[in-house]
Amino acid sequence: LVPHLGDREKRDSVCPQGKYIHPQNNSICCTKCHKGTYLYNDCPGPGQDTDCRECESGSFTASENHLRHCLSCSKCRKEMGQVEISSCTVDRDTVCGCRKNQYRHYWSENLFQCFNCSLCLNGTVHLSCQEKQNTVCTCHAGFFLRENECVSCSNCKKSLECTKLCLPQIENVKGTEDSGTT
């Protein structure tokens, strides 16, 4: 099976690497623009220079290209708790991340929110907090894990999954209730 190529990929594949086919004259291969620049004018003829201009402030291109415009720099999303790790430059987009002792939860491929790492109160750290994963906690006896927090078995209702972990405590509570009735 031949992979399906878009028009642009078809045009580019006719030229050697680092060059692209002139949009008005498919016998001419123009040199692509370096990262940090964009295509202002196609090369006028074979062996002649492509007119590339540097990206303006607030925009970038991260690889060689023949884009008519630079890409807008990303902004870190304050409402998601994101902070700027490194600023946007002409050849690199803004890098956003989280503060110390926080991890990223990805809502989608490109959207993440910062959350505080769990401290494992009433438990121990099984796996330390990572850039993209919360601390994994192991709970002490008499506690069960709910949303990565160790919660007292006194909060375990019969309908919940915690019943297996809290079985002795539930039995005791049930026994206490039974002994109170005559």
């Epitope: 999303r77 809502w107 989608s108 959207l111 929110q113 949303e147 990565n148």
Partner: nanobody, 122 residues
Framework: EVQLLESGGGLVQPGGSLRLSCAAS????????MSWVRQAPGKGLEWVSW????????FYADSVKGRFTISRDNSKNTLYLQMNSLRAEDTAVYYC???????????????RGQGTLVTVSS
């Protein structure tokens, strides 16, 4: 067929509370991030809140942070929105939706319910 049915809206005085519910069917509710979005009269759609499949992660718009609480009961296929300290500016039609974040911050979703009207007025 996917169905999202909101309930719990109504007229409430400023400072009052309401609890919205959304009954979901036709898809695996427990595996999906779910959200509440709203549309005030004459305005566009606005994110209110969303919650991860198991409820461990939540997001709130700045305008509702500290006043609204999103939760879910996967055993009942139901999404909730507890709204406290309601203000006149919270007046809107509230929709339960399965969000799509491709165009964030623009509101986008795979599907949403018919909505429930919340009116905050004295």
């Amino acid at each position: 067929e996917v169905q999202l049915l909101e309930s719990g809206g109504g007229l409430v005085q400023p400072g009052g509370s309401l609890r919205l519910s959304c009954a979901a069917s036709g898809f695996t509710f427990a595996k999906e991030t779910m959200s509440w979005v709203r549309q005030a009269p004459g305005k566009g759609l606005e994110w209110v809140s969303w919650i991860s499949p198991h409820g461990a992660h939540t997001f709130y718009a700045d305008s509702v942070k500290g006043r609204f609480t999103i939760s879910r009961d996967n055993s009942k296929n139901t999404l909730y929105l507890q709204m406290n300290s309601l203000r006149a500016e919270d007046t809107a039609v509230y929709y339960c939706a399965k969000p799509r974040f491709s165009y964030y911050p623009r509101v986008s979703f795979d599907y949403r319910g018919q909505g429930t009207l919340v009116t905050v007025s004295s």
